[in-house]
């Protein structure tokens, strides 16, 4: 119920032991009381006790004081609970009866006789203070007090405001004396269901699901989620917004991992070679003649430059070399020929032209062939023309570069942004990283390409009322309530019928 009308009987006086009809009780008036509480009537009439009724056992004989008793038979004050909005007005009928029968259940005894009765009509506000009164007639006097108080969890001037303290998913609050909610520490909002995040937690970049927590959104870190996360792999750089990599002084490249002053800091080039701060590793060594290798660390064989011509073979000698010439050739580099055009010295379809009045010759080579006798096939890939690990392929008179993924251009010199293809679905933000693109997904999506829609259990919040069963899965973010008998509505919120005593009915 929503409230209780309490009546405290204090003293009853019937000194002459008389009944209402003028007869006397023998040996004395064994007195019990009947109480009837009903809605306000200007003139009290018989009829149902609409607000409740109660009877006492025999409390004494003729004149007696009624003591307070908290339990069992003869409880005092008497309790008349109600489960409706207290209207503020009432009618009360207190009757004193004599019984010749059972002390504990005098109501059931035959031969009960009325001693006296009183009727009170008026207004009464809800409150803890007792209203005391005394009623006299020619034979009797009754002293009593009464009040109306709200039941547990009911508040307000008419006990109509239901408030039950809770500390769960639906709210974290206690109830004020007027029934309004008082949030527990760490919670806020109309229903105290919104946590107060850790003090200083960034409003946009952080959030919380319980008090004093600060959970960072993607791209942010730190106790208060106010520090951005730099680009994955960023070595010598910082960020002012997530996934940025702004290089520290002296560093460059996508990941700020290229030392822009490598030559000065590390002196990588050997054997008197020249160092320049450029190239894929941040530096390039230009070797002096006779040296090779990335750092010009390798001394070349004197024959390395292929000084012997016309198929002569080269032999290394200390500080020098020697050419062994094939038949028909002579000179330090086998550069002179004893052959003439009559010997058909030009290979691979080369044309022979006589020189020095026929004492020597020169070959004019067709495309793709070279050498003084057109004996060498031209390899256009020897100069390593393809950058960024591209593969060089000879194709007839020309050559092509087959580029690795992420590069393009004639020499694979152009870097393709992986993000140019817009790989992130559902409005995700793309970031170019060393191992491919990375997507930062908006709320409600996940996966490498933000292709996975995050669904939640729509029944988790307990949306169905009045004991209904909740079902999900019928559509992604939806639920269906299966109502118990007597309720309708999308969340079973409407009772179909309410008996007059139903607690919701004022």
């Amino acid at each position: 119920g929503s409230g209780i009308f309490q009546l405290r009987l204090q003293e009853f006086v019937n000194q002459r032991g008389m009944l209402a009809n003028g007869q006397s009780c023998e040996p004395g008036c064994r007195t019990f009381f009947r109480i009837c509480l009903k809605h306000f009537q200007a003139t009290f009439s018989e009829g149902p006790c609409t607000f409740g009724n109660v009877s006492t056992p025999v409390l004494g004989t003729n004149s007696f004081v009624v003591r307070d008793k908290n339990s069992g038979s003869g409880r005092n004050p008497l309790q008349l609970p109600f489960n409706f909005t207290w209207p503020g007005t009432f009618s009360l009928n207190i009757q004193a009866w004599h019984t010749p029968g059972d002390d504990l259940r005098p109501e059931t005894s035959p031969g009960n006789s009325l001693i006296s009765q009183i009727i009170i009509q008026g207004s009464l506000a809800v409150g803890k203070i007792w209203r005391t009164d005394e009623q006299n007639d020619t034979l009797t006097r009754l002293s009593y007090s009464y009040r109306v108080i709200c039941s547990d969890n009911y508040y307000g001037e008419s006990c109509s405001r239901l408030c039950k303290k809770r500390d769960d998913h639906f709210g974290h609050y206690e109830c004020q004396p007027d029934g309004s909610l008082s949030c527990l520490p760490g919670w806020t909002g109309k229903y105290c269901d919104q946590p107060i995040c850790l003090s200083g937690c960034h409003e946009q970049n952080g959030y919380c699901s319980k008090p004093d927590e600060c959970i960072c959104r993607p791209g942010w870190q730190g106790r208060l989620c106010n520090e951005c996360i730099p680009h994955n792999g960023c070595r010598h750089g910082t960020c002012s917004i997530p996934w940025q990599c702004a290089c520290d002084e002296g560093w460059g490249g996508l990941f700020c991992d290229q030392d822009l002053n490598y030559c000065t800091h590390h002196s990588p080039c050997k054997n008197g070679s020249t160092c320049s701060n450029s190239g894929p590793k941040g530096y390039t060594c230009t070797c002096l003649p006779g040296y090779t290798g990335e750092h010009c660390e390798l001394g070349l064989s004197k024959c390395a430059s292929n000084p012997c011509r016309n198929g002569g073979s080269c032999k290394d000698q200390e500080n020098s070399y020697h050419c062994l010439c094939p038949p028909g050739y002579y000179g330090q580099h086998c550069e002179h020929s004893t052959l003439t055009c009559a010997d058909s010295p030009c290979f691979n379809g080369g044309s022979c032209r006589e020189r020095n009045q026929g004492s020597s010759y020169a070959c004019e080579c067709p495309p793709n062939f070279t050498g003084s006798n057109c004996e060498k096939k031209v390899d256009r890939c020897t100069s390593n023309p393809c950058a960024n690990g591209g593969q060089c392929q000879n194709r007839g008179p020309s050559r092509t570069c087959r580029c690795r993924p992420g590069f393009t251009g004639t020499h694979c010199e152009l870097h393709i942004s992986d993000c140019a293809r817009s790989p992130c679905a559902h409005g995700g933000t793309c970031h170019d990283l060393e191992n491919g693109p990375v997507c930062t997904c908006p709320a409600g999506f996940s996966g490498r390409r933000c292709e996975v829609r995050i669904t939640h259990d729509a029944c988790a919040s307990g949306p169905c009322f009045n004991g209904a069963t909740c079902y999900t899965g019928l559509s992604p973010n939806n639920f269906v309530c299966n109502c118990p008998y007597g309720f309708v509505g999308s969340r079973c919120e409407f009772p179909v019928g309410l008996p007059p005593s139903f607690p919701w009915v004022a």
Partner: nanobody, 117 residues
């Protein structure tokens, strides 16, 4: 808590029409489910028509095709248009609201509808 005040009740001839209106206080009115109940003397209070949280409507069998419930969230009102009234429709009509997260219900004070034959 939403405060509800009904209006529009009165005396009408059988087969006549009446429009009941319920004005609600509170800025979150649009989130509440709303309904009309009625109670004739000595009978239980019964659901006449309701607008659920998802906007779906529900009617008692005895009023289907004659009564229409509607709401105007801009004006914080819910209305019940009653056509082809019958003597058995006479009762006190109550406005009822349901809180979206607690399920607690609030009642208006009621408005009397009398149908004379």
């Amino acid at each position: 808590e939403v405060q509800l005040v009904e209006s529009g009740g009165g005396l009408v001839q059988a087969e006549g029409s009446l429009r009941l209106s319920c004005a609600a206080s509170g800025s979150t009115f649009s989130t509440y489910a709303m309904a009309w109940y009625r109670q004739a003397p000595g009978k239980q209070r019964e659901l006449v028509a309701g607008i659920s949280f998802d906007g779906s409507t529900h009617y008692a069998e005895s009023v289907k095709g004659r009564f229409t419930i509607s709401r105007d969230d801009a004006k914080n009102t819910v209305s019940l248009q009653m056509n082809s009234l019958k003597p058995e429709d006479a009762a006190v009509y109550y406005c009822y609201s349901v809180h979206p997260s607690t399920g607690f219900g609030s009642w208006g004070q009621g408005t009397q509808v009398t149908v004379s034959s």
